[in-house]
């Protein structure tokens, strides 16, 4: 069995997706997603489609990109439904109660499904070379695909904590996936890092009645800066605060505020920091997957920030207006996400109460390992 190259990503809507390379039948794949705390993924349109495409394009699976791969998704045509040649989904439907985006905004069919009104049929997402989505393909439910896609829904998210003086950041998400970067963190994500003097720090995203917040995070950065400036959430010196156009690209550390010149930080007059301790620079760098929006405030409630109703696990909401899909492992090329031998998710904040593990660690380091369950 090849080592699995599991990857995952979250969109600001509170939806997270994971990609798994494992040869299995549809029913086993669906159960695997449930055991992970999610469900077999829909891939409707807009942000959801972009999130899944980002996972696929992050890198080939075990085959090394030499062949087309098939991934189970929550798309099927029930026994009593007919093939509809003029419909975008050809009579197939997504296994969720939420109508989601426009069905016309979907991938094409690699092959036209067989015309039938009697037999239940499943469908897979075919990926050329394992990375480039080609479209949907009808497949008998009892056959084995090369992998599957899971979806997880969270009510609230924590924005990435700003590192400050922290180094060696490591994120562990509730599904036990590991990464060095995560812009939006579901509850249960644990971030560990080293502060100056190699002092370890660990914070956990927890959900409460207000929203989601980083437990044990004092101030708004993981490790306080020795100086006055932060750039892209990290400690900086004044000379490094000018961008390519000469604009001021830093913000002020806790206890400092932007001076009248608009490009230096001075001691807060009354000790009243703006924006929770950060001064507002005249110009901010654009938000990217590796550069969190500096002024981002939290906790983020999905309904507050995105104008939606609150998301709950039983719902299947997708926001279609997100231009960037932040994803785990998004620094440079997305790293293969690994599960840790020591990792345990927090019982009260996982999406569901159980997580998948792998205990045969004879393959390469990319093999998920000791991925134990937690129940609320």
């Amino acid at each position: 069995e090849h080592p699995t190259a599991d990857r995952a990503g979250c969109s600001a809507s509170g939806a997270c997706y994971s990609l798994h390379h494992a040869t299995m039948k549809r029913q086993a794949a669906e159960e695997a997603c449930i055991l992970r705390g999610g469900a077999l993924s829909t891939v409707r349109a807009g942000a959801e489609l972009r999130a899944v495409l980002a996972l696929l394009r992050a890198g080939p699976g075990p085959g090394g990109g030499s062949k087309d791969l098939l991934f189970w998704v929550a798309l099927e045509r029930r026994r009593s439904h007919c093939t509809l040649e003029n419909e975008p989904l050809r009579g197939f439907s997504w296994l969720s109660s939420d109508p989601g985006g426009l069905e016309s905004d979907t991938l094409q069919w690699v092959e036209e499904p067989q015309r039938s009104c009697t037999a239940r049929r499943c469908a897979v997402l075919q990926a050329t070379g394992g990375v480039e989505p080609a479209g949907w393909k009808e497949m008998r439910c009892h056959l084995r695909a090369n992998g599957y896609l899971c979806k997880y829904q969270f009510e609230v998210l924590c924005p990435a904590p700003r590192p400050g003086a922290a180094s060696n950041l490591s994120y562990r998400a509730p599904f036990q996936l590991h990464s060095a970067a995560l812009d939006f963190s579901p509850p249960g994500t644990e971030v560990s890092a080293l502060c100056r003097g190699q002092l370890p720090i660990s914070v956990t995203c927890i959900a409460d009645e207000i929203g989601a917040r980083w437990d044990k995070l004092s101030g708004d950065v993981l490790c306080p800066c020795p100086g006055r400036y932060l750039r892209a959430g990290k400690c900086a010196e004044l000379p490094n605060c000018l961008d390519d156009l000469g604009g001021f690209a830093c913000e002020c550390a806790t206890g400092f505020e932007l001076g009248k010149d608009g490009r230096s930080c001075v001691t807060s007059g009354e000790g009243q920091p703006t924006l929770g301790g950060t001064g507002v620079p005249t110009r901010r760098p654009p938000a990217t997957a590796t550069s969190p929006v500096p002024q981002r405030t939290w906790p983020i409630r999905v309904d507050e920030k995105l104008g939606e109703t609150p998301l709950v696990p039983e719902q299947d909401n997708s926001v279609t207006s997100i231009p960037e899909i932040p994803r785990w492992g998004s620094q440079s090329t997305m790293s293969t996400l690994q599960m840790s031998l020591q990792a345990e998710s927090k019982a009260t904040i996982t999406p569901s109460g159980s997580v998948i593990s792998k205990f045969n660690s004879t393959t390469s380091s990319a093999t998920p390992q000791a991925f134990d369950s937690s129940s609320a």
Partner: antibody, heavy 119, light 108 residues
Framework: EVQLQQSGTVLARPGASVKMSCKAS????????MHWVKQRPGQGLEWIGA????????SYNQKFKGKAKLTAVTSTSTAYMELSSLTNEDSAVFYC????????????WGQGTSVTISS | QIVLTQSPAIMSASLGERVTMTCTAS???????LHWYQQKPGSSPKLWIY???NLASGVPARFSGSGSGTSYSLTISSMEAEDAATYYC?????????FGGGTKLEIK
């Protein structure tokens, strides 16, 4: 015909470990999740965890983490559950069970392995 | 985790009587993932009703199941002696999969 044949009654002392087996036949062992369920005398059913023999993925109920360890040997189509640090609370009947086409209902069950803990 | 509460815990019914038992979930469960099992003393549980309303193979037509969301029920239209057993509801909408405490059905 699908069958799950479990190992026989076990009598063990507190603090010891036991390993029970569940031999599957009549279906492709590596293609389906195998679940384990506990039932204490006169009580209800508790899900312990599951294993996918095809790639050895496992999932545990947090309550049984550290207590139960699930393994599978594909060459013999046999699933195993090892229980460690046994206490009186572990006296129960343990079932192996797997779904087979009924929307994740556990529709095939072994006959159960009875474990009694006594000093 | 989703907690399933069955009521009543114990009930008795006369032969030919209509019997209804309920299963209430602590949060919404998809009807596709709500099932019922029958267990008799000394035997393994048997799948009885799957996906809320589908009778498993060999289950008499006097049994039926219904419900949605957080409320589900199993009904026997006309109680027979062989129906005396304990019935468990079970969900797998969210992991960990959970069972109700059971309803023990006796003959009056």
């Amino acid at each position: 015909e699908v069958q799950l044949q479990q190992s026989g009654t076990v009598l063990a002392r507190p603090g010891a470990s036991v390993k029970m087996s569940c031999k599957a036949s009549g279906y492709t062992f590596t293609s389906y999740w195998m679940h384990w369920v506990k039932q204490r005398p006169g009580q209800g059913l508790e899900w312990i965890g599951a294993i996918y023999p095809g790639n050895s993925d496992t999932s545990y109920n947090q309550k049984f983490k550290g207590k139960a360890k699930l393994t599978a040997v594909t060459s013999t189509s046999t699933a195993y559950m090892e229980l460690s640090s046994l206490t009186n609370e572990d006296s129960a009947v343990f079932y192996c069970t797997h779904y087979y086409g009924s929307d994740y209902a556990m529709d095939y069950w072994g006959q159960g392995t009875s474990v009694t803990i006594s000093s | 985790q989703i907690v399933l509460t069955q009521s009543p815990a114990i009930m008795s019914a006369s032969l030919g009587e209509r019997v209804t038992m309920t299963c209430t979930a602590s949060s919404s469960v998809s009807s596709s993932y709500l099932h019922w099992y029958q267990q008799k003393p000394g035997s393994s549980p048997k799948l009885w009703i799957y996906s809320t309303s589908n009778l498993a193979s060999g289950v008499p037509a006097r049994f039926s199941g219904s419900g949605s969301g957080t409320s589900y029920s199993l009904t026997i239209s006309s109680m027979e002696a062989e129906d005396a057993a304990t019935y468990y509801c079970h969900q797998y909408h969210r992991s960990p999969r959970t069972f109700g405490g059971g309803t023990k059905l006796e003959i009056k």
